[in-house]
């Protein structure tokens, strides 16, 4: 979900935005800081083994409105939050995994202890 309000079409920021990046740092990042004309994000999702993994970084303006909308994906537990209000604003984003649905237990992978 977007933390700073929805807009119908993304408008270009007058200045570059710096974001914290983790597991999602582009080549042009330095010291785990990336730069963008769009949004900072933090995302939590389950990996193949069902372990929650947190990633953060930069989303370019192109397509970021769609990516920040956090549309549910079947059989994939994932949540993303985006922000633009200040540099490294995504340090303070803490998305949580959506609750498991009954169907997820049936359709999802079976984990053996």
């Amino acid at each position: 979900k977007k933390e700073d309000g929805e807009s119908t079409a993304p408008t270009a920021r007058p200045k570059v935005l710096r974001c914290k990046c983790h597991h999602h740092c582009p080549e042009d990042s330095v010291n785990n800081i990336c730069s963008t004309d769009g949004y900072c994000f933090t995302m939590i999702e389950e990996d193949d083994s069902g372990t929650p993994v947190v990633t953060s970084g930069c989303l370019g303006l192109e397509g970021s409105d769609f990516q920040c909308r956090d549309t549910p994906i079947p059989h994939q537990r994932r949540s993303i939050e985006c922000c633009t209000e200040r540099n490294e604003c995504n340090k303070d984003l803490h998305p949580t995994l959506p609750p498991l649905k009954d169907r997820d237990f049936v359709d999802g992978p079976i984990h053996h202890k």
Epitope: K15, V16, R18, P26, D37, G38, E62
Partner: antibody, heavy 116, light 112 residues
């Protein structure tokens, strides 16, 4: 129109510190980063660092970490760069420059002379 | 740091001639957003630099259309189609893709 006003010259002694100023007008100060660039006579331009006046966030060139400190006063739309432990190597013209995704406007520069 | 290599260092021209200045970066200047942050500035004696071209090929406001920029990746060119007296000075390329931002060493455009 966008203007970045800098004092023309500063003369300081070796070992001392100096605080250079850059007063911005003609635009919303917090909507752009402010960068500082060094130019020595006959040499190229060197990027020192930048500050975002909206949240005081700074990025420095490693080479100038510990030498330069960038600050802003949003009430007067003024950016500052403090240079410490000055030596003759710090004698140069220092420019402030407005930055969005590229520098579009430069100050006229302050000529810093470090001499006893 | 990204090294910006400019050629030639000096460019003697006759007024009305075409002039080309080249800039090569030590790594690609294509940013992760897809933009290429390569820019050109002109510095006249005793003045601060002035922006001519931003993001490879976009003329800044008030810049005459005899100035044009081109290139991609690591190789870029600034062309002046018909040199005028007011064009004389030192031209710098600059990149703002990678921190620290860096500049070319400059090309001095002078009368032949």
């Amino acid at each position: 129109q966008v203007q970045l006003q800098q004092p023309g010259a500063e003369l300081v002694k070796p070992g001392a510190s100096v605080k250079l100023s850059c007063k911005a007008s003609g635009y919303t100060f917090t909507s752009y980063w402010m960068q500082w660039v060094k130019q020595r006579p006959g040499q190229g331009l060197e990027w020192i660092g930048e500050i975002d006046p909206s949240d005081n966030y700074t990025l420095y060139n490693q080479k100038f970490k510990g030498k330069a400190t960038l600050t802003v006063d949003t009430s007067s739309s003024t950016a500052y760069m403090q240079l410490s432990s000055l030596t003759s190597e710090d004698s140069a013209v220092y420019y402030c420059a407005r930055f969005g995704y590229y520098v579009d406007y430069w100050g006229l520069g302050t000529t810093l002379t470090v001499s006893s | 740091d990204v090294v910006m290599t400019q050629t030639p260092l000096s460019l003697p021209v006759s007024l009305g001639d075409q002039a080309s200045i080249f800039c090569r970066s030590s790594q690609s200047l294509v940013h992760s957003t897809g933009n290429t942050y390569l820019h050109w500035y002109l510095q006249k004696p005793g003045q601060s630099p002035k922006l001519l071209i931003y993001k490879v090929s976009n003329r800044f406001s008030g810049v005459p259309d005899r100035f044009s920029g081109s290139g991609s990746g690591t190789d870029f060119t600034l062309k002046i189609s018909r040199v005028e007296a007011e064009d004389l000075g030192v031209y710098f390329c600059s990149q703002s893709t990678h921190v620290p931002f860096t500049f070319g060493s400059g090309t001095k455009l002078e009368i032949k």
